[in-house]
């Protein structure tokens, strides 16, 4: 029961996390104009991974996509890649984990297969969460660097009477959504890995010993296994979990999504 709850909770937490990663990736407010000395501004700038926007005090908002690919900073491209990898891995992980859920019956899938799939999805969620956290952190670092550079530029003399307004950018809402979502996905992944251990209890492999009693044909097995009638019908303990050494068709047959990254 606890295993099912852990697995189910891990799935739900990861689902919320991945939804958050997708939301953060699509959001326009990765960086927002710093209102350090003017809390009410007539023109407010904010930027996302895919477009930059300007909101005027008139209520008019204009967004422009980054239509160039080569002209964009390498760091931005890296952040995009990390977020997309995170989403793709998370999506595959969700797909795998649905089939791995203990509460869902699919044909005659053995617990060992479910354990394998639970572990696979858990690892995918962990990597997905780490990708999101890394992506958001790289962007945040880029913002901090640019912030202090623009601050330095603001206080260096222009030489003339004319002042130039330097727009500084600070952390946008998407960064916090991304950090939280990445963390949730990571936690969900860890929970799936914990659940996987519960799905595959460690067993001692003893050779079954048959005791022949007169008039009865009963095979006694150590380890609390049920006795089964008949000679040699179930004389070997089945391995429930083999530490992921098997190549399960269910796991391996998913199409590779790395072409999209």
């Amino acid at each position: 029961m606890a295993v099912t709850a852990c697995q189910g909770l891990g799935f739900v937490v990861s689902l919320i996390g991945i939804a958050g990663i997708i939301a953060a990736t699509c959001m326009d407010q990765w960086s927002t104009q710093d209102l350090y000395n003017n809390p009410v501004t007539a023109v407010f700038n904010y930027q996302g991974l895919w477009r930059s926007c300007v909101r005027e005090s008139s209520g008019f908002t204009e967004c422009r996509g980054y239509f160039t690919l080569l002209g964009l900073p390498a760091m931005l491209q890296a952040v995009r890649a990390l977020m997309i990898v995170g989403i793709v891995l998370g999506a595959i992980g969700l797909l795998v984990s649905i089939f791995a859920l203990k509460c869902i019956r699919i044909g005659s899938m053995e617990d060992s297969a479910k354990a394998n799939m639970t572990l696979t999805s858990g690892i995918m969620f962990i990597v997905s969460g780490l990708c999101a956290i890394a992506g958001v952190s790289v962007f945040a670092n880029m913002l901090v660097t640019n912030f202090w550079m623009s601050t330095a530029n603001m206080y260096t003399g222009m030489g003339g009477m004319v002042q130039t307004v330097q727009t500084r950018y600070t952390f946008g809402a998407a960064l916090f959504v991304g950090w939280v979502a990445g963390g949730l996905t990571l936690i969900g992944g860890v929970m799936m890995c914990i659940a996987c251990r519960g799905l595959a209890p460690e067993e001692t492999n003893y050779k079954a010993v048959s005791y022949h009693a007169s008039g009865h044909s009963v095979a006694y097995k150590p380890g609390g296994f049920k006795a089964s009638t008949g000679f040699g019908s179930n004389t070997k303990n089945k391995k429930i979990y083999d530490g992921g050494a098997r190549t399960e068709d269910e796991v391996q047959s998913y199409p590779s999504k790395h072409d999209y990254v």
């Epitope: 009410v40 501004t41 023109v43 930027q47 209520g59 008019f60 004319v162 002042q163 307004v165």
Partner: antibody, heavy 115, light 113 residues
Framework: EVQLVESGGGLVQPGGSLRLSCAVS?????MNWVRQAPGKGLEWVAW????????TYADDFKGRFTISRDDSKNTLYLQMNSLRAEDTAVYYC???????????WGQGTLVTVSS | DIQMTQSPSSLSASVGDRVTITCKSS????????????LTWYQQKPGKAPKLLIY???TLESGVPSRFSGSGSGTDYTLTISSLQPEDFATYYC?????????FGQGTKVEIK
Amino acid sequence: EVQLVESGGGLVQPGGSLRLSCAVSGYTFSMNWVRQAPGKGLEWVAWINMYTGEPTYADDFKGRFTISRDDSKNTLYLQMNSLRAEDTAVYYCARLVRGNGMDYWGQGTLVTVSS
Amino acid sequence: DIQMTQSPSSLSASVGDRVTITCKSSQSLLNSGNQKSYLTWYQQKPGKAPKLLIYWASTLESGVPSRFSGSGSGTDYTLTISSLQPEDFATYYCQNAYSFPFTFGQGTKVEIK
């Protein structure tokens, strides 16, 4: 079609108060009050976001003037306190549009501060 | 606050003349986010409310004749009337629309010569 109609202007003594109204019909996201002293240029007074009620003022009017709106009546207000002779002007309400330009203006209401 | 300085303060011209009014701001009105200059031009006739002519320094408001044009970037802006018409005799104002408080130029009065 947007229409802006101001009212509430008149003669007031120095130190007195007055509340100007601007009846708004049609879509407005944000509004301004702009004034013009006789024979002088335009002077921006205040701005308000008609949805959130967030205001901002020119430095000369902070503390003395209050811009507000009444959603139910679709009306914009300018509460003017501690009036001075130099506040004598025609007061206009104007709608802010794309590019932060003011496209629709009221007909203006004259406020005269004199003893 | 951003100061707006218009020149000339008044000018005399004849119908059909090309008229140029300049406006200088104490700070750049160019927004880096969309590369647009937040400068607005208005026309005002005596006893009437101002009329919006141009926003974003060069975008003509709908219904405004094409003889009006705006140009400039950063701190220097120009309003040009290519062929002055009798109805164009009025006072013209430029406005900082980039940051609060919004500020207007002192105005340029265009009179009949």
